[in-house]
Interface confidence: low
């Protein structure tokens, strides 16, 4: 039976140009993480392997950076970015946990006049 | 729309060079990783060497038939590849492609490397 | 190096068909695998990237399958266009390498 819970960053904000951290943490289960992918829709952006590490798809490679930890930095934002992204964690034996976050990436002014621009 | 396109292709002699180039539009250039890929007639893909965008540092990665011989460079004005060759063999004869990340390819241009 | 192999040349199936086609890493590539159509005299096709992502306008009957070492390009209701030679390669690591090709023809 699967008993873990995923806890996410939930919807963030972030300024066009600038940089953000996805994090997603699982919970209540003593499964072991296989593989962790982000998705950004039905895009894969990267994979955290537990034996083999990290690896960027290429076609992201110049704007994400793996971490910290399983999460996910994004860099050079653009308003292109704004959507949802999901964790998706594999593990033995419970099977796949998925978390969701949404990313609204504003324009400068927005993000410099208004309260919804955060760092996690 | 995404295009490429080869050219510089011909005919040399064994220790020669000849400096390929890849005529790009319809994108960034700046912003993506660009690839040769070799095919010897009647042969399989080879993957040759890339040289990745700016915010990569334009850094470079070579297979080992290549490395030391061949030299990938990107003229980023003009949004041009490029891939000299030196010390020219036999087998390097092949129609040369460059690609983009993303699966975009050119239609290849044609080294015969022949006495 | 990551040898990529492709176990058969050649395969002949009738129109209409289905055929698969499989490549075998000699380490894991976690699905970094892409799949390219080749006609003679043009440029290869990118099929499928990500061992299962179908790229736009290419037709649903090709599908790509596999994890780890082993991967498959699936083609069902063989047309006289699907004829060509076709290659996996990985990009999991540097260098990124291609399998020898796979030729298909029609019976």
């Known amino acids: 039976m699967m008993t873990g819970t995923i806890e996410t960053t939930g919807n963030i904000s972030a300024e066009k140009g600038g940089s953000i951290i996805l994090q997603c943490h699982l919970s209540s289960t003593t499964a072991q993480v296989t593989q962790v992918n982000w998705e950004q829709q039905d895009q894969l952006l990267a994979i955290c392997n537990a034996d083999l590490g990290w690896h960027i798809s290429p076609s992201f490679k110049d704007r994400v950076a793996p971490g910290p930890g399983l999460g996910l930095t994004l860099q050079s934002l653009t308003v292109n970015d704004t959507g949802e992204y999901f964790c998706i964690y594999h593990t033995y034996p419970d099977g796949t946990y998925t978390g969701r976050i949404f990313l609204e990436v504003l324009e400068s002014s927005v993000a410099e006049h208004g309260a919804r621009f955060q760092i996690p | 729309e995404v295009n490429l396109v080869e050219s510089g292709g011909g005919l040399v002699q064994p220790g020669g060079s000849l400096r390929l180039s890849c005529a790009t539009s319809?994108?960034?250039?700046?912003?993506?990783?660009m690839s040769w890929v070799r095919q010897p007639p009647g042969k399989a893909l080879e993957w040759l060497c890339l040289?990745?965008?700016?915010?990569?540092?334009?850094?470079?990665e070579y297979s080992a038939s290549v490395k030391g011989r061949f030299t990938i460079s990107r003229d980023n004005s003009q949004s041009i590849l490029y891939l000299q060759m030196n010390t020219l063999r036999a087998e390097d004869s092949a129609t040369y492609y460059c690609a983009r990340d993303g699966g975009y390819w050119g239609q290849g241009t044609t080294l015969t490397v022949s006495s | 190096d990551i040898q990529m192999t492709q176990s058969s040349s050649y395969l002949s199936v009738s129109l209409g068909g289905r055929v698969t086609i499989t490549c075998r890493a000699s380490?894991?590539?976690?699905?970094?695998l892409a799949w390219y159509q080749q006609k003679p005299g043009n440029a290869p096709r990118l099929l499928i990237s990500?061992?299962?992502s179908l790229e736009t306008g290419v037709p649903s009957r090709f599908s790509g399958s596999g994890s780890g070492k082993d991967y498959t390009l699936s083609i069902t209701s063989l047309q006289t266009e699907d004829v060509a030679t076709y290659y996996c390669?990985?990009?999991?690591?540097?260098?990124?390498?291609f399998g020898s090709g796979t030729k298909l023809e029609i019976k």
């Open positions: 990500g061992a299962t």
């Open positions: 319809g994108f960034t250039f700046n912003d993506y990783y």
């Open positions: 390669q990985q990009y999991w690591s540097i260098p990124f390498t």
């Open positions: 040289i990745r965008n700016k915010a990569n540092g334009y850094t470079t």
């Open positions: 380490d894991h590539i976690n699905n970094w």
